[in-house]
């Protein structure tokens, strides 16, 4: 059961091996699942010694573990690909790495583009 | 890091109990938190779930309607209320954490507490 | 709900064997799949997470595969400390559900 949880329609799109599956690149994604599912956004990225590389971004299907998560906030120490997801329109479009070992918030700002729609 | 369960022991059918899971080493309130039992000799049965602010719960059939999952997220507490206690509910109960990363997998897990409904 | 199913349900083994224990799952769990271990009289503990994700901690002689409905753990060269009880979980939908379990004994 689930109460006031934020409905997700939109979630930002980008897919970093866009070229080898021939999908497009970045823009918005329309979520769409099954009646009575939730839906949310996800981000992924890998850390490379402090230069982040977003792997992907998108909608998420029902998962428990992202209800009533306003913000895409990854917990994990040191994943080989972090993972956070959230609840509400464009979501994703930031994602915070916010560590349990007590290290520093990192917050990743996306570059201002225009973004296209997916279909 | 870790979970310490409380609550358990000896009830009479039809009987209530409070586990309490007390929890430790990690963000609490960031992580959607699980219970699941273990019969004496038998496998693992799952239970019940709260999501991390507690706006969503979810129980198996099997305790639909007499168990009762929250939380107090500034105790760092979760809890299951059983009420109407039947045999079958004889178990060692665990709290268990969702892993924060992709798969909904159970990383940190409780020492059980055990439940013996008997007359 | 999703019905798990495990093979073989035990297994007996030496130290330095290679163990392979198989997790069928009764529809498509795409990759949410986890593999714990369990000793007596203690709680489980995670393994391998998303089919193939070692967990943190855990030693690289465990390894999972799989996606979909079939799924393998295998343990390569079996340590004293391996031999316990091998759980199978799918995360894909509620209710969770877990495998019956393969108890791994000394031969």
């Known amino acids: 059961s689930g109460r006031g949880e934020a409905e997700t329609r939109e979630c930002i799109y980008y897919n970093a091996n866009w070229e080898l599956e021939r999908t497009n690149q970045s823009g918005l994604e329309r979520c769409e699942g099954e009646q009575d599912k939730r839906l949310h956004c996800y981000a992924s990225w890998r850390n490379s010694s402090g230069t982040i590389e977003l792997v992907k971004k998108g909608c998420w299907l029902d998962d428990f573990n992202c209800y009533d998560r306003q913000e895409c906030v990854a917990t994990e120490e040191n994943p080989q690909v972090y993972f956070c997801c959230c609840e509400g329109n464009f979501c994703n479009e930031r994602f915070t790495h916010l560590p349990e070992a007590g290290g520093p918030e990192v917050t990743y700002e996306p570059p201002p583009t225009a973004p296209t729609l997916l279909t | 890091v870790q979970l310490v369960e409380s609550g358990g022991g000896l009830v009479q059918p039809g009987g209530s109990l409070r586990l309490s899971c007390s929890a430790s080493g990690f963000t609490f309130s960031s992580y959607a938190m699980h219970w699941v039992r273990q019969a004496p000799g038998k496998g693992l049965e799952y239970v019940s779930a709260?999501?991390?602010?507690?706006?969503?719960?979810y129980y198996a059939d099997s305790v639909k309607g007499r168990f009762t999952i929250s939380r107090d997220n500034s105790k760092n507490t979760l809890y299951l209320q059983m009420n109407s206690l039947r045999a079958e509910d004889t178990a060692v109960y665990y709290c268990a954490k969702t892993y924060g990363g992709y798969g909904n997998a159970f990383d940190i897990w409780g020492q059980g507490t055990m439940i013996t409904v008997s007359s | 709900d999703i019905q798990m199913t495990q093979s073989p349900s035990s297994v007996s083994a030496s130290v330095g064997d290679r163990v392979t224990i198989t997790c069928r799952a009764s529809?498509?769990?795409?990759?949410?799949l986890a593999w714990y271990q369990q000793k007596p009289g203690k709680a489980p503990k995670l393994l391998i997470y998303?089919?193939?994700n070692l967990q943190s901690g855990v030693p690289s002689r465990f390894s999972g595969s799989g996606s979909g409905t079939d799924f393998t753990l295998t343990i390569n060269s079996l340590q004293p400390e391996d031999f316990a009880t091998y759980f199978c979980?799918?995360?894909?939908?509620?209710?969770?559900?877990f495998g019956p379990g393969t108890k791994v004994e000394i031969k």
């Open positions: 979980q799918q995360g894909k939908s509620f209710p969770y559900t």
């Open positions: 529809q498509g769990i795409s990759r949410w």
């Open positions: 998303a089919a193939s």
């Open positions: 709260i999501s991390s602010n507690g706006g969503s719960t």
